[in-house]
């Protein structure tokens, strides 16, 4: 851009340097050139010159319009052609920019993540503005009335450290830019119910040599919550759809869990926990891929092809609708929710 | 309860430069997002730059590249430096809690002159 050019005469920009995407707009020069009266003035956009709609106001000044600006930034820049100088003359120039006044922030979300120290706030900012755009995160305590502000480009993180004279906030976001400024809707906000605890991985898998084999899964976490409630799920990497276990989990030992699959398979899983009746998930953990053995019986069991009984214990019996079967045959099968639809969630997808 | 006072204005040439201050009482300043506005003669008040407790900092257009916001916790003093003024940037001056606003809080303020 042209931030630090020496002028001999002005350059204007109607309506202003930022302006609204779509605007019409004038950009004016005027020459105050010493010996030179010049034959023409010459506009250039980003080092081109222009042809048209171009006006020569009288003998200092001229005028080049253009109809419905939409570039983000030019650099305009004007010249004389002096009579006798070989090379035109530089006049001045100006940085321009289009762009959007801000949308109204939405989706505001803050969350605590265990043992960072930081609240962090998210939220989305809408359609792209073009134009420098700024958000002032606004933290209120509901039990003080102190309001503290920070400024942010996307997201927030803030010391828990100066959140410690209160547990109850109202938080809300404004976004500013040159053209206009909006506000977010107010997030009521509690310090106890937004945490959410500790990354939950899974650490290793293995496949039992079994008559119906038998794949256990071993998860972990650090975190310091006593009542945590999990989602496991799980596909073959073949298959789009997520099969997904629900646990109750107790993270002071690893955490072990039984599932019946297809064999000779290559499967993907994912964990994630919150806070037992807390709102806030982690994010799904990193995909643990693992290989079961090929079949050693002749059974070959599908399982997204029969009912299941949701429960949100460890397992989930698979039953058959029939009351004749004897008890003794009624087979308990591994849990596996087939919810009939993609598991949803803040994740990334595999597969 | 708060108090606010500005200094460092004064009489200078287009071109020049100044350092306002802004002393600080009656709250947590380390805590707190400030801002500076400013009043030309006759007109209304313009918001000219803000400071967030962690030192991020946003500007007015009119001033972006040529004012500086800083703040100093330790002395509980807001800042702006102003360089290669303009005529148009002589207004009285004014400091004020939070980071973006056209109001101030009933400060003395102080008066910069930019005339050859």
């Known amino acids: 851009g042209i931030t630090s050019i020496n002028c001999s005469g002005d350059m204007w920009v109607e309506p202003g340097e930022i302006f609204q995407m779509g605007m019409n707009v004038s950009i004016y020069c005027q020459e105050a050139l010493k010996h030179c009266r010049p034959r023409n003035l010459y506009f250039y956009k980003n080092g081109f010159k222009e042809e048209f709609d171009i006006t020569r106001i009288n003998r200092t000044t001229a005028r080049i319009w253009y109809k419905g600006f939409s570039e983000p930034h030019a650099y305009m820049h004007c010249t004389a052609e002096c009579p006798g100088h070989f090379q035109e003359t530089l006049i001045c120039g100006k940085d321009i920019s289009s762009g959007h006044p801000p949308d109204a922030p939405s989706n505001l979300t803050c969350v605590i993540y265990e043992y960072s120290g930081n609240m962090t706030c998210t939220w989305n900012t809408g359609k792209p503005t073009y134009i420098d755009t700024k958000y002032i995160v606004h933290v209120k305590s509901l039990e003080t009335e102190e309001e503290q502000q920070y400024l942010a480009s996307s997201y927030v993180k803030i010391s828990t450290d100066s959140l410690q004279g209160s547990r109850k906030y109202l938080v809300w976001v404004q976004a500013v830019n040159s053209l206009g400024m909006e506000n977010s809707q107010q997030l009521h906000v509690h310090l106890d119910d937004i945490v959410i605890p500790s990354a939950s991985i899974i650490s290793r898998a293995e496949t039992t040599n079994d008559t119906v084999p038998k794949t256990i899964v071993y998860w972990k976490s650090k975190t310091m919550i006593e009542k945590v409630f999990c989602e496991m799920r799980y596909k073959t990497t073949t298959n789009q759809t997520w099969s997904v276990k629900e646990f109750d989990a107790n993270f002071t030992y690893v955490q072990q869990s039984e599932f019946y699959l297809e064999p000779d398979s290559k499967y993907v899983f994912q964990v994630r926990c919150q806070e037992t009746g807390k709102r806030n998930w982690q994010p799904w953990s990193s995909p643990f891929v693992h290989q079961t053995s090929q079949e050693t019986g002749k059974r070959n069991w599908q399982p997204w092809s029969s009912p299941f009984v949701h429960q949100t214990s460890q397992t989930v019996s698979q039953v058959t609708a029939k009351s004749s079967h004897e008890p003794q045959k009624m087979e308990m099968l591994s849990a596996t929710i087939f919810r009939g639809h993609p598991a949803s969630g803040n994740h990334q997808d595999i597969g | 309860q708060v108090q606010l006072q500005e200094s460092g204005g004064g009489l200078v040439q287009p071109g020049g430069s100044l350092r306002l201050s802004c002393a600080a009482s009656?709250?947590?300043?380390?805590?707190?997002?400030m801002r500076w506005v400013r009043q030309a003669p006759g007109k209304g008040l313009e918001w000219v730059s803000g400071i967030d407790s962690r030192g991020s900092t946003i500007y007015a257009d009119s001033v972006k590249g040529r004012f500086t916001i800083s703040k100093d916790n330790a002395k509980n003093t807001l800042y702006l430096q102003l360089n290669s003024l303009k005529t148009e940037d002589t207004a009285m001056y004014y400091c004020?809690?939070?980071?973006?606003?056209?109001?101030?809080?009933g400060s003395q303020g102080t008066q910069v002159t930019v005339s050859s």
């Open positions: 004020a809690q939070g980071v973006y606003g056209d109001t101030h809080s």
């Open positions: 009656g709250f947590t300043f380390r805590l707190t997002a």
